[in-house]
């Protein structure tokens, strides 16, 4: 988002293009309230970064994120018998990703058409609300999953209904919290007509009066409360987890679990480094610059960071893969174009020779009792 200049001589500068236009003159339109952007921002809005690079990334996220998270949600809801806390958190994570990714075709079309939003005010607000909602939901559910993974190591006890109910309660609380914190994004007018560029932007330009204090304070609060604090909890959980794994007894089964645990930690770390940290940092820096200088010199970086934050929808399936045995089975077989039932039939003759899955599988397997770590 960049600072727009309200050229209205009266009233709040929250209105971008009051009911579109007042009347047409020649090939152009007469605007009642108009926003102007600086040349650098205009070059970003018309350049290849936003009109080529962003649509490519969003297309990749959509193509990868929609089927993988869709399959994950289906596996967690219908193919996982015992709903462990980890399964509940991952199901919510997949749902959050899906709710964001389903709007990506509109986002892709918006950027391809030169950052021109033609789908109306309401859809823009939904898109933006779900975009940020997904990022903060992902952070919170990832934190819950990380803390739960550690908790399972510390207390390697069987699945209990109570734990599942607590996880459901926490998940509902997270959804409610995210709904509340994203309310400003649904309330604020996000579409602004830029006469100089002849485009209607969605969230990319916001009126100056709104941005000066409110947006900086808003994103700073979110960065501290919904990013830094959960990030600290996640990091603590994994540091303690690594310590526990180092001191644990070594056998072939434990080694396999340890490797998977390390892969999970690396995946979550990558997610923080690629998706969450740059976007939250640049959201604060970008709005601070606008607040203090009236323009942001990090606008291009901010755009890229927000774009990369959507990659969490592609990285989340790797988390499911390292945590859930059921998802692992379905993912492998989906990639090999085999049905799980066929594979299960093939494995029937081998089950007596192998260790019981009850004692060896990862914690969110449908028949798991023991922990994976």
């Amino acid at each position: 988002t960049i600072q727009g200049t309200n050229r209205s001589s009266k009233g709040r500068s929250l209105i971008g293009k009051v009911d579109g236009t007042s009347h047409v003159t020649g090939k152009g339109v007469t605007v009642e309230t108009v926003f102007s952007v600086d040349e650098f921002s205009a070059s970003v809005l018309t350049g290849k970064l936003t009109t080529v690079f962003l649509p490519i990334v969003y297309t990749i996220v959509f193509v990868v994120g929609l089927p993988s998270n869709g399959m994950a949600l289906w596996v967690f809801l219908f193919r996982t018998k015992k709903k462990h806390p980890a399964v509940i958190y991952m199901a919510n994570l997949a749902l959050a990703d899906l709710l964001s990714v389903i709007w990506f075709p509109l986002k892709i079309a918006y950027h391809i058409h030169g950052n021109n939003w033609i789908y109306g005010e309401a859809l823009c607000n939904v898109l933006i609300g779900f975009f940020y909602g997904n990022m903060y939901c992902s952070i919170l559910f990832m934190t819950c999953l990380s803390v739960q993974r550690y908790w399972v190591i510390v207390n390697p006890m069987g699945h209990s209904r109570k734990k599942a109910n607590i996880a459901i309660g926490i998940s509902l609380a997270i959804w409610l919290l995210i709904l509340l914190v994203t309310i400003p994004l649904y309330v604020v007018k996000q579409t602004i007509f830029i006469p100089a560029l002849n485009i209607t932007t969605c969230h990319d330009v916001l009126p100056e009066q709104l941005l000066v204090g409110d947006m900086f304070n808003y994103f700073l609060s979110l960065a501290i409360g919904v990013f830094l604090f959960p990030a600290f909890l996640t990091a603590s959980a994994y540091v303690l987890m690594i310590r526990m794994l180092r001191s644990s007894a070594m056998d072939e089964n434990s080694e396999k679990k340890r490797k998977r645990a390390i892969k999970l930690i690396v995946t979550v770390l990558a997610m923080y480094l690629i998706c969450f940290t740059p976007s939250n940092l640049l959201l604060v820096v970008h709005y601070f610059l606008i607040k203090s200088q009236g323009q942001s010199h990090v606008y291009a970086l901010y755009i890229v960071a927000l774009c990369l934050s959507t990659l969490n929808s592609c990285i989340d399936p790797f988390v499911y893969y390292f945590v859930s045995h059921d998802f692992r089975d379905h993912a492998k077989n989906a990639l090999l174009c085999r049905s799980v039932r066929t594979v299960k039939q093939m494995q029937v003759s081998l089950t007596s020779k192998k260790h019981s899955r009850k004692s060896s599988s990862y914690s969110s397997s449908s028949t798991t009792v023991k922990t994976s770590y």
């Epitope: 040349e39 002849n198 009236g294």
Partner: antibody
Framework: QVQLVQSGAEVKKPGSSVKVSCKAS????????VIWVRQAPGQGLEWMGV???????YYAQKFQGRVTITADESTSTAYMELSSLRSEDTAVYYC?????????????WGQGTLVTVSS | EIVLTQSPATLSLSPGERATLSCKAS??????LDWYQQKPGQAPRLLIY???SLATGIPARFSGSGSGRDFTLTISSLEPEDFAVYYC????????FGGGTKVEIK
């Protein structure tokens, strides 16, 4: 070089309209906006409206409904028409070039056109 | 609407003296303020844009400073051709001119 040449002085009756032209040279009207400013005798400068290179226009609230700014790319000329003239509209009307972006000033100005509204 | 207040209304100085003109905005306009010079019977001429950037072809004796709400145009040593009316213009939120400061020969 960049130049803005305005039409000559006009004397108009109250209630009538005036159309002032501003011929641009040294730059393209499709890449730049043209703004209009007026100055009543012995008074300060007053911003009236703008036309962007793509034809979009915006007018100061004071003049909305009375002013129309147009541009003809083929002749590189911008026009400002003010209707329902009254005696207080007697002023020198200036056109100026504007890049169309927030961080750009009005860098080149026309010589001005004196419009006298008198019965 | 943002109001720009220029002071003093008139500045009486001799050639060679330093002139300091002030422009105060009713709200924060960051760096988005330009200075124009106007001589009788002539169109305004751009001197300074974005608070402190010197326009093309303008002598170095002209300088601008300030940001936010308070801005200053300084003419380090007045030349005979510098005696004119100076206007500030803000373009952060709307376009508004200041009332002008007349720099006259003492």
């Amino acid at each position: 070089q960049v130049q803005l040449v305005q039409s000559g002085a006009e004397v108009k009756k109250p209630g009538s309209s005036v159309k002032v032209s501003c011929k641009a040279s040294g730059f393209s009207l499709s890449s730049y906006g043209v703004i209009w400013v007026r100055q009543a005798p012995g008074q300060g400068l007053e911003w009236m409206g703008v036309i962007w290179g793509n034809g979009n226009t915006y007018y100061a609230q004071k003049f909305q409904g009375r002013v129309t700014i147009t541009a003809d790319e083929s002749t590189s000329t911008a026009y400002m028409e003010l209707s329902s003239l009254r005696s207080e509209d007697t002023a020198v009307y200036y056109c100026a070039r504007w890049r169309g972006y927030k961080d750009y000033p009005f860098d080149y100005w026309g010589q001005g056109t004196l419009v006298t509204v008198s019965s | 609407e943002i109001v720009l207040t220029q002071s003093p209304a008139t500045l009486s100085l001799s050639p060679g003296e330093r002139a300091t003109l002030s422009c105060k905005a009713s709200q924060n306009i960051y760096k988005y303020l330009d200075w124009y010079q106007q001589k009788p019977g002539q169109a305004p001429r751009l001197l300074i844009y974005n608070a402190n950037s010197l326009a093309t072809g303008i002598p170095a004796r002209f300088s601008g400073s300030g940001s936010g709400r308070d801005f200053t145009l300084t003419i380090s040593s007045l030349e005979p051709e510098d005696f004119a009316v100076y206007y500030c213009l803000q373009h952060n939120s709307g376009w508004t001119f200041g009332g002008g400061t007349k720099v006259e020969i003492k």
